[in-house]
Interface confidence: low
């Protein structure tokens, strides 16, 4: 079970899953991606208070000293656990080609 | 090769693995480990600026969109690419027993 | 020494438009998120904005009408402010943040420079 | 936008009294909140942050608690540099809340 999965901010304001929707010239891959011409890009965002969603001891650590330590140790970010592979059509010297690309689209978040 | 690793801040601005000294007061840890009493922390901390370390697809993304809509999409972050094992010696009801730990120690830092 | 100092403040007519300087000196501007603050006279504090690495935000009032920005060439971070009103006489501060986790605590500041908005 | 409530907005206290200001903000803000001191024609000067995390080189007989909406600083035995104005204010930023003020709390000599 993930660790502090409620968070004190109130619904929605911890790290969690969201999306936004960004353009091919939003990313810069107009030249170099056809299809899709819109993606919506799930990504990582919100606050990492004290022990929510830790990724792991490191995080655990990292929460204790930033309290000590605030001018030297940052607090954990929230940043993706895991991603899904997306397709996108790219173009070549010779026309287009498929590419899949697995570490695109955050699955789940933690904090690390 | 690893995308971006000069960093435009200056020397040792961007992120990169530094070493914070803690004792297991700091770190909550007095109640249940008898050794280290002090641990030397490897950490990822600094600044992640347009493509320095950026680990993959997701983070370049991210990048693009935290320069389009600053308010809604944060930069990337910096964080452990990889671990070091670290062996804790821990009280237990017994006496002690020896416990590593894969996830405790930062290795490699990268921007995600 | 840390240091920031503030200039650019005096008399402007409302409707007018100001630029605020706050020269960093004893460290790095480009390394840390900075904030304005400001303070009507016998007021309290109140939240202009803040610059990170690579955006800014704002508080609701400030939107449209005041851009934050430096110039990391010279260590100096800007407030540019248009369509003054009288109610925007106040000392404008510039903080630097003191570390930039999920909180923005202000440890550093300047001495302010007074805006007075008046016809 | 979080609006921050301090209360009282000022109060009359002797040398040695124990102070207590109290912040509450309009939304559930964790821990992220930071407490300032002015005093007059100076800038402020952070006391604490993350609620409970004393500022390099402030007197321990300051401290700070709360978590949440409410908040409280307290000034153990209030010595004669500690009258001053004190302001609380929220961090917390991430979804371009922005970080607002309280109104003051200003600590007078009786």
């Known amino acids: 079970a993930r660790n502090g999965d409620h968070c004190p901010l109130g619904p929605g304001r911890c790290c969690r899953l969201h999306t936004v929707r960004a353009s091919l010239e939003d990313l810069g891959w107009a030249d170099w991606v056809l299809s899709p011409r819109e993606v919506q890009v799930t990504m990582c965002i919100g606050a990492c208070p004290s022990q929510f969603r830790a990724a792991n001891m490191h995080a655990q650590i990292k929460t204790s000293l930033h309290r000590l330590k605030p001018d030297t140790v940052p607090a954990p970010c929230c940043v993706p656990a895991s991603y899904n592979p997306m397709v996108l059509i790219q173009k070549t010297d010779t026309g287009v080609s498929l590419q899949t690309y697995d570490d695109l689209l955050a699955k789940d978040c933690h904090c690390i | 090769a690893r995308n971006g690793d000069h960093c435009p801040l200056g020397p040792g601005r961007c992120c990169r693995l530094h070493t914070v000294r803690a004792s297991l007061e700091d770190l909550g840890w007095a109640d249940w480990v008898l050794s280290p009493r002090e641990v030397q922390v490897t950490m990822c901390i600094g600044a992640c600026p347009s493509q320095f370390r950026a680990a993959n697809m997701h983070a370049q993304i991210k990048t693009s969109l935290h320069r389009l809509k600053p308010d809604t999409v944060p930069a990337p972050c910096c964080v452990p690419a990889s671990y070091n094992p670290m062996v804790l010696i821990q009280k237990t009801d017994t006496g002690v027993s020896l416990q590593t730990y894969d996830d405790l120690l930062a290795k490699d830092c990268h921007c995600i | 020494e840390v240091q920031l100092v503030e200039s650019g403040g005096g008399l402007v007519k409302p409707g007018g438009s100001l630029r605020l300087s706050c020269a960093a000196s004893g460290f790095s501007l480009s390394n840390y998120y900075m904030s304005w603050v400001r303070q009507a006279p016998g007021k309290g504090l109140e939240w202009v904005g803040m610059?990170?690495?690579?955006?800014?935000t704002y508080a609701t009032w400030a939107k449209g009408r005041f851009t934050i920005s430096r110039d990391d060439s010279k260590n100096t971070l800007y407030l540019q402010m248009n369509s003054l009103k009288t109610e925007d006489t106040a000392v404008y501060f510039c903080?630097?943040?003191?570390?930039?986790?999920?909180?923005?605590?202000?440890?550093?500041w300047g001495q302010g420079t007074l805006v007075t908005v008046s016809s | 936008d979080i609006q921050m409530t301090q209360s009282p907005s000022s109060l009359s206290a002797s040398v040695g009294d124990r102070v207590t200001i109290t912040c509450q903000a309009s939304q559930s803000i964790s821990s992220v909140l930071s407490w300032y001191q002015q005093k007059p024609g100076k800038p402020p000067k952070a006391l604490i942050y993350?609620?409970?995390i004393l500022a390099s080189g402030v007197p321990s007989r300051f401290s700070g608690s709360g978590s949440g909406t409410d908040f409280t600083l307290t000034i153990s035995s209030l010595q004669p540099e500690d009258f001053a104005t004190y302001y609380c204010q929220a961090n917390y930023d991430v979804y371009n809340y922005g970080n607002p003020f309280g109104g003051g709390t200003k600590v007078e000599i009786k």
């Open positions: 610059i990170s690495f690579s955006g800014t």
């Open positions: 993350e609620a409970s």
């Open positions: 903080a630097r943040v003191v570390y930039a986790g999920w909180t923005y605590p202000l440890g550093i």
